[in-house]
């Protein structure tokens, strides 16, 4: 939601004033701001909080691991890509306390909200990886035992990486600074000018590439770990199952509304009642889907003391061995009840 | 390229309005505003309202009470209507982007001369 | 309102002399949130619309010549043309975009 027939994360629109008050200048902003961009900031600023904290936590606990522990590869490059999104935080609270004013400067407004949306889809891209090699571990243990090594799984993020940039691409490409109203405010936004199709294109292919693929791919993975893992009474059940609840529901309660919101906004009138109503939410959506950034720690620390009762053990520690044990055993031919356990664990990431 | 076409009647009767239509080519009304300006036979330029790309409005307070603007989006239309014409009403009005820094009309429509007479 | 004041209202120059032309606010364009002065001025010929030659009070518009040169800040603005060609002879109107739209009276340019 980034252009500005729909104003977003970033710049807002303003209240029709057509009665003026000659005395002062006619600013369209009123001086206090909507709810839904109070909830978003008190939203922002504890994802903030939370979000470089733990995630720089977990990057600080998997980087030491990173070269001999598959796991630890995943969870560096989801915290390193959380981490980044939370940096752009103040940028964005900074805008929106100011009424949607962008003070930052014409290369900040190309760079910045792309960089935030770069490590939003990494984050997805991310996520689907690491349930595509809980898939493998289940099912393909032969072949992870072959195959599965450091070398592939950093190509695999790489992809995921590659992928999220060629997502943020038209973001970049078509992001500029303009002033409007009075006094004049400089708002950032990406600027589709003629273009409808292309600016519906784009909306298409980030719900598709950014909420439904990594939502179908992660439905249908844990439906079958699930299926395996109760069939062959590896792990206690109803752990595993709030665990991938969790997992599912998270990811699709926090990026739903930004993208069913992208995706009307691409496709109605601007003028229409339905848009002005979610030009206001946008924010607030924006915000939500920004939980994402903070919850993977959060997750990893409550699956550490749940599954292990690690309660007094101290948070580094606590992670390490939440992030950084092996999943495949050295046989060949079945999973441990720890290997399973561990690896319920690591899906909570998702 | 940027173009602004301007249409609407040359010749208005006294207490009649006036209606303009600014069709844009080249950029899209939902980035950018529209500004409505005169200019009278030998006068300078006088500012009139404008239309925002999100559809607000803001307009000069001698005008504020007969003049309307209004836009539609999907067919690149910007619309002027100011009613209660009188003789000194007369001038050439233009219509103009608002270019997207500095709040200045970067692109200008070629010019509506409207001469009010019966 | 801000009330535009331009000054001289006319000016007679000869080809390649250097130009002045003054534009005073009755209240500062400084935008504190911006930090932009909100003046522009715009070149006008007989029977053309009229052309955007400077915003920000001194930035000049793509593919306006460099011999047109805006400055000043809050409320004094001046207009430079470094050496007039006779394809400068026009009206200058300087305009604010602070607090609504005010255009000055305009300075016409002609021939000596």
């Known amino acids: 939601m980034d252009s500005f027939n729909y104003t977003t994360p970033d710049y807002g629109h303003y209240d029709d004033k057509d009665t003026l008050d000659l005395n002062t200048p006619v600013d369209k902003t009123s001086n206090t701001l909507r709810v839904p961009d109070i909830l978003a900031l008190v939203i922002f600023a504890v994802v903030f909080l939370v979000g470089v904290l733990g995630n720089a936590l977990v990057v600080w606990v998997t980087a030491f691991e990173a070269k001999r522990t598959i796991n630890a590869i995943w969870f560096l490059n989801l915290a390193v890509a959380d981490f980044l999104s939370c940096l752009a935080l103040p940028i964005l609270f900074t805008s929106i306390v100011q009424h949607h004013h962008w003070p930052f400067g014409g290369a900040a407004c190309s760079i910045l909200p792309s960089l935030i949306l770069l490590n939003m889809y990494a984050s997805i891209l991310l996520l689907a990886t690491i349930s595509a090699d809980r898939f493998l571990l289940v099912f393909k243990p032969i072949w992870c035992q072959n195959f599965r090594g450091a070398g592939l799984a950093w190509i695999a993020c790489a992809v995921a990486w590659g992928l999220a940039l060629l997502l943020t691409i038209p973001s970049f490409l078509y992001r500029v600074v303009r002033e409007e109203y009075f006094p004049p405010k400089v708002l950032c936004g990406v600027d589709y000018s003629h273009d409808k199709r292309r600016e519906r294109a784009v909306a298409i292919v980030r719900l598709v590439l950014g909420f439904l693929w990594p939502l179908l791919t992660l439905t249908i993975c844990y439906t079958f770990i699930l299926l395996r893992t109760w069939s062959r009474r590896a792990t206690r059940s109803t752990k595993t199952l709030k665990v991938v609840v969790a997992v599912v529901a998270s990811f699709f309660i926090f990026w739903l509304p930004y993208q069913v919101t992208g995706i009307m906004m691409s496709f109605l009138e601007p003028s229409s009642p339905t848009f002005l109503l979610l030009k206001k939410l946008d924010s607030l959506c924006v915000s939500f889907a920004y939980i994402n950034c903070c919850i993977n720690p959060i997750i990893y620390v409550v699956a550490g003391q749940g599954f292990q009762g690690r309660l007094r053990k101290s948070l580094p520690s606590l992670l390490r061995n939440v992030l950084t044990e092996e999943s495949v055993v050295r046989e060949s031919k079945s999973f441990t009840r720890s290997t399973v356990d561990t690896m319920a664990q690591k899906t909570q990431a998702v | 390229q940027v173009q602004l076409k301007q249409s609407g009647p040359g010749l208005v009767q006294p207490s009649q309005s006036l209606s303009i239509t600014c069709t844009v080519s080249g950029f899209s009304l939902t980035s950018y505003g529209v500004h409505w300006v005169r200019q009278s036979p030998g006068k300078g330029l006088e500012w009139l309202g404008v239309i925002w790309s999100g559809g607000s409005t803001d307009y000069n307070a001698a005008f504020i009470s007969r003049l309307s603007i209004s836009k539609d989006n999907s067919k690149s239309q910007v619309f002027f209507k100011m009613n209660s014409l009188q003789a000194d009403d007369t001038a050439i009005y233009y219509c103009?982007?608002?270019?997207?820094?500095?709040?200045?009309?970067?692109?200008w429509g070629q010019g509506t001369s409207v001469t009010v007479s019966s | 309102d801000i009330v535009m004041s331009q000054s001289p209202s006319s000016l007679a120059v000869s080809a390649g002399e250097k130009v002045t032309m003054s534009c005073k606010s009755s209240?500062?364009?400084?935008?504190?949130?911006?930090?932009?002065?909100?003046l522009a001025w715009y070149q006008q010929k007989p029977g053309q619309s009229p052309k955007l030659l400077i915003y920000w009070a001194s930035t000049r518009e793509s593919g306006v010549p460099d011999r047109f040169t805006g400055s000043g800040s809050g409320t004094d603005f001046t207009l430079t043309i470094s050496s007039v060609q006779t394809e400068d002879l026009a009206v200058y109107y300087c305009k604010q975009s602070y607090n609504l739209l005010t255009f000055g009276a305009g300075t016409t340019l002609e021939l000596k």
């Open positions: 209240q500062s364009l400084l935008s504190s949130r911006t930090r932009k002065n909100y």
């Open positions: 103009a982007r608002n270019g997207l820094l500095g709040n200045a009309m970067d692109y």
